[in-house]
């Protein structure tokens, strides 16, 4: 058998000679011969090769299916795939993207940490204690407390990591 | 590590003859094509002659066609170039290439000087 | 024959300069085009070749452009070690034929 390393890093061995390989965007038609240099064709409408090859039929570009969320977010070449991402509100459910589900909704009690995007989830994290979430929400952060001092109000009621303070006004002291 | 070894240059007057030779090491010769190129002093590069990897297949540019002969020993990992007729105007450093798709002029030798006077 | 019209035949440039260099073919070549770098008594060497491919252990600030019959050779940032003589060549068709060569030269 032949040394691996006979022909360089863009060629192929065949029949004791070293061919050029394709370049990306087209498929091989023939191999080299002692009278031709190896015959390549470019990849046709919505196919791509993306290395330098000898395949004899390119790759069809992804589909990205409407019906599973997903909408084209770059235009494959003959170079390059298409890349698919998801419709607003949805996201990838892998890093292929072949399909999508809808964005995960922090609880009550729990604010969004960092905002869903076309491939990752909706990050949620617990309300800290001066902060609360009283709504199922993709967007919503925790809020603070209300602050009743500077409304020169009092607490009524303790906030918790679901509702807000009530505030209510101070009490007077008869004369 | 490719290493190819010009040598058989020198002072010829014209119409006489030389013949190039060329020692090739560290790849598989007889996998590859291989050209002479040359370049007379202070001027650019010339393409001279190009042998297909078992001989079968040669080009020559047009000046140099049936005055010189481009061959091949593969089992010597050799490459030459017999030159008959020789003109001033062929005088050049005379460079042996490996000829490959897709990088073609991709290793060279040192050269070998041939003056014709 | 395919005729190739290199140019500028010479040019001065500072360290740091950013240099082009264009090949023009009397024809479509297809990006059948090698860029070399020749030093004074020195063999030449590839840096590019098929038009925009950089050769194995060819600095980065090299790159070639082009296709059809216009092509470009790049140096993003002149180094001391470029200051050169630089040629293409084409690999269309037979004969193969270079350009006229391009000389760096320090400003």
């Known amino acids: 058998p032949e040394p691996p390393t006979a022909c360089r890093e863009k060629q192929y061995l065949i029949n004791s000679q070293c061919c050029s390989l394709c370049q990306p965007g087209q498929k091989l038609v023939s191999d080299c011969t002692e009278f031709t240099e190896t015959e390549c064709l470019p990849c046709g409408e919505s196919e791509f090769l993306d290395t330098w090859n000898r395949e004899t039929h390119c790759h069809q570009h992804k589909y990205c299916d409407p019906n599973l969320g997903l909408r084209v977010q770059q235009k494959g070449t003959s170079e390059t795939d298409t890349i698919c991402t998801c419709e607003e509100g949805w996201h990838c459910t892998s890093e292929a993207c072949e399909s999508c589900v809808l964005h995960r909704s922090c609880s009550p009690g729990f604010g969004v940490k960092q905002i869903a995007t076309g491939v990752s989830d909706t990050i949620c994290e617990p309300c800290p204690v001066g902060f609360f979430s009283n709504v199922s929400s993709a967007f919503e952060k925790c809020h603070p407390w209300t602050s009743c001092e500077t409304k020169d109000l009092v607490v009524q009621q303790a906030g918790t990591n679901k509702t807000d303070v009530v505030c209510g006004p101070q009490d007077r002291l008869r004369a | 590590e490719v290493q190819l070894v010009e040598s058989g240059g020198g002072l010829v007057q014209p119409g006489g003859s030389l013949r190039l030779s060329c020692a090739a090491s560290?790849?598989?010769?007889?996998?590859?094509?291989m050209a002479w190129v040359r370049q007379a002093p202070g001027k650019g590069l010339e393409w001279v002659a190009t042998i297909s990897t078992s001989g079968g297949n040669i080009y020559y540019r047009d000046s140099v066609k049936g005055r010189f002969t481009i061959s091949r020993d593969n089992a010597k990992n050799s490459l030459y170039l017999q030159m008959n007729s020789l003109r001033a105007e062929d005088t050049a450093v005379y460079y042996c290439t490996r000829d490959t798709a897709p990088y073609y002029f991709d290793y060279w030798g040192q050269g070998t000087m041939v003056t014709v006077s | 024959d395919i005729q190739m019209t290199q140019s500028p035949s010479s040019l001065s440039a500072s360290v740091g300069d950013r240099v082009t260099i264009t090949c023009r073919a009397s024809?479509?070549?297809?990006?059948?085009l090698n860029w070399y770098q020749q030093k004074p008594g020195k063999a030449p060497k590839l840096l590019i070749y098929r038009a925009t491919n950089l050769e194995d252990g060819v600095p980065s600030r090299f790159s070639g452009s082009g296709s059809g019959t216009d092509y470009t050779l790049t140096i993003s940032s002149l180094q001391p070690e470029d200051f050169a003589t630089y040629y293409c060549?084409?690999?269309?068709?037979?004969?193969?034929?270079f350009g006229g060569g391009t000389k760096v030269e320090i400003k």
């Open positions: 024809q479509d070549i297809g990006n059948y």
């Open positions: 560290g790849f598989t010769f007889s996998y590859f094509p």
């Open positions: 060549v084409q690999h269309k068709q037979y004969p193969l034929t």
